[in-house]
């Protein structure tokens, strides 16, 4: 808490300008009117205030707006945003994309801080949903943003927002997140033709069920091995050798290099060896010829 002292004669600030960098902390407190500061916040960023001086300016705004800053002030906080705590930010109502961009710009190049996470939360609540424009903006600053959300949070993403998602935005998503995103992507891209659809849906296929993979195998999509390796194991296991061959097309040869890794390893264990031999890749570990295959999961379901 800065002590209240009278402003020395002739030092009362008429506007926010560079002369203020020579003011001591107590002089800033005494001589800068909080309302003036609020209306000229956009100038603060251009002035090389010390961290201690910024603390004083923040204190003045806190006194003026104990219930939380108005968005017209928030938009122009600039580096003063770095002084805000998540508790401060929780009091804000942020709805403008330009406000969000301006504050994300301040934090650019750094990891997502608790302040930024809280800001994004306030923004999404203020707008009513995580819309396409928001997603565009957030993934531009934080490519991994989408994958930082819980499946519950992702469930509120409207399918229309999926158009904003780039493949690299999904790099760190786990299967639970892709399980939520895949049906939305399927809905978003449903009116596209076969090849265009596959290009768009490819990044989301880690959430695809078996029946969708079977359908894709009929469409000459030539899935690459990197995508295949990210598929859900439980979705891959029921696929026949013929279906996997059609799904991968010329990339089927890559199975040999991945035969020790999931889901390829587990899939091989479920196939008849003579079916695997038809691929001519030397894949080993299938069910020997003459063995009977019991589907225990079906048996459990019946009992």
């Amino acid at each position: 808490e800065v002590e209240k002292t009278a402003c020395p004669s002739g030092k009362k600030a008429r506007e926010i300008d560079e002369s203020l960098i020579f003011y001591k902390k107590w002089e800033l407190e005494a001589c800068v009117d909080a309302a003036l500061l609020a209306t000229q916040m956009d100038r603060v960023n251009a002035i090389p205030f010390t961290y201690e001086q910024l603390d004083v300016l923040k204190h003045k705004l806190d006194e003026l707006y104990p219930q939380g800053y108005p968005e017209s002030v928030i938009q122009h906080l600039g580096y003063l945003f770095l002084k805000m705590s998540p508790e401060d930010i929780r009091k804000w109502n942020v709805t403008s994309l330009e406000t969000l961009k301006a504050l994300l710009e301040v934090n650019k190049g750094h990891e997502m801080s608790p302040q930024v996470a809280t800001l994004i939360d306030r923004f999404v609540k203020g707008r009513g949903q995580l819309d396409k424009d928001t997603l565009d903006t957030l993934t531009a600053f934080y490519p991994g943003y989408l994958c930082s959300l819980s499946p519950e949070e992702l469930s509120s993403v409207p399918p229309s927002s999926i158009w904003a998602v780039r493949p690299q935005d999904l790099d760190t998503c786990d299967p639970r997140q892709l399980d939520v995103l895949y049906p939305k992507a399927r809905l978003a891209f449903q009116n596209m033709n076969g090849s265009e659809y596959f290009v768009k849906i490819q990044s989301f296929l880690g959430g695809a069920p078996t029946e969708d993979l079977k359908a894709l195998s009929q469409q000459n999509v030539s899935m690459d091995l990197a995508t295949f390796m990210k598929l859900r194991t439980d979705a891959v296991l029921p696929l026949t050798v013929a279906e996997v061959q059609k799904l991968l097309g010329p990339h089927v040869e890559g199975l040999k290099a991945e035969e020790r890794h999931r889901p390829v390893r587990d899939w091989i264990l479920r196939q008849r060896q003579d079916d695997l031999d038809t691929l001519g890749l030397g894949l080993q570990g299938g069910i020997p010829n003459g063995y009977l295959v019991l589907d225990l999961s079906m048996q459990e379901a019946l009992s």
Epitope: E71, T95, Q129, D136, S160
Partner: antibody, heavy 119, light 110 residues
Framework: QEQLVESGGGLVQPGASLTLTCTAS????????MCWVRQAPGKGLEGIAC????????TYYASWAKGRFTISKASSTTVTLQMTSLTAADTATYFC????????????WGPGTLVTVSS | DVVMTQTPSPVSAAVGGTVTIKCQAS??????LAWYQQKPGQPPRLLIY???NLESGVPSRFKGSGSGTEFTLTISDLECDDAATYYC????????????FGGGTEVVVK
């Protein structure tokens, strides 16, 4: 007195290009959205494009307007809308409107300029 | 893009009566809605912003309500001068909202 005035409208041939200008007077232009909205005869309002004056300078377009319409800041008091490959469906009164620094609340509108596309 | 749907159109009522115009958003927009009045040959005039805030100079007979996806404009004590077309609009900034006007509702005063 705050005022917006559109100019550049008129009769043009199908396939032609046209640039409309919005001139502001009595306005601090530095912190506002400036947008173009059109209205075909007897029809409703249709947003075209917006530009954020100051700050990021971001431009935003309606999905139908991307590629054929370009909004830009020509000077400290003027915003333009370039329109290409015009068709009869582009016949409308074109308004410029000023939003706030935060959103598309349009408190100030120009009187509009009529663009007629016909051969 | 967000789609704004207005109903009904036209709507008519007698002088002194009340009319209610509804506006529905295709997705939740919280309180991000404005209402405009437009008369022939004139640009629109802002009446209500942020769903329920009355613009300066607009009579209190105009009342906005709603949040999320459902919004209402109510005009009470109807006057002849209220005969016009009324538009709702999502006010959020961004590409998705540039063209976020409702189709308009014509109010006829008898």
């Amino acid at each position: 007195q705050e005022q917006l005035v559109e100019s550049g409208g008129g009769l043009v041939q199908p396939g032609a290009s046209l640039t409309l200008t919005c001139t502001a007077s009595g306005i601090d232009f530095s912190r506002y959205y400036m947008c173009w909205v059109r209205q075909a005869p007897g029809k409703g309002l249709e947003g075209i494009a917006c530009i954020y004056i100051g700050g990021s300078g971001s431009t935003y377009y309606a999905s139908w307007a991307k590629g054929r319409f370009t909004i830009s800041k020509a000077s400290s008091t003027t915003v333009t809308l370039q329109m290409t490959s015009l068709t009869a469906a582009d016949t409308a009164t074109y308004f410029c409107a000023r939003g706030t620094n935060l959103n598309y609340i349009f408190r100030l509108w120009g009187p509009g300029t009529l663009v007629t596309v016909s051969s | 893009d967000v789609v704004m749907t207005q109903t009904p159109s036209p709507v008519s009522a007698a002088v002194g009566g009340t009319v209610t115009i509804k506006c529905q958003a295709s997705q939740s927009i919280n309180n991000g809605l404005a209402w405009y009045q437009q008369k022939p040959g004139q640009p629109p005039r802002l009446l209500i912003y942020s769903a329920s805030n009355l613009e300066s100079g607009v009579p209190s007979r105009f009342k906005g309500s709603g949040s999320g996806t459902e919004f209402t404009l109510t005009i009470s004590d109807l006057e002849c001068d209220d005969a016009a077309t009324y538009y709702c609009q999502c006010i959020w900034d961004g590409n998705s909202y540039v063209n976020a006007f409702g189709g308009g509702t014509e109010v006829v005063v008898k």
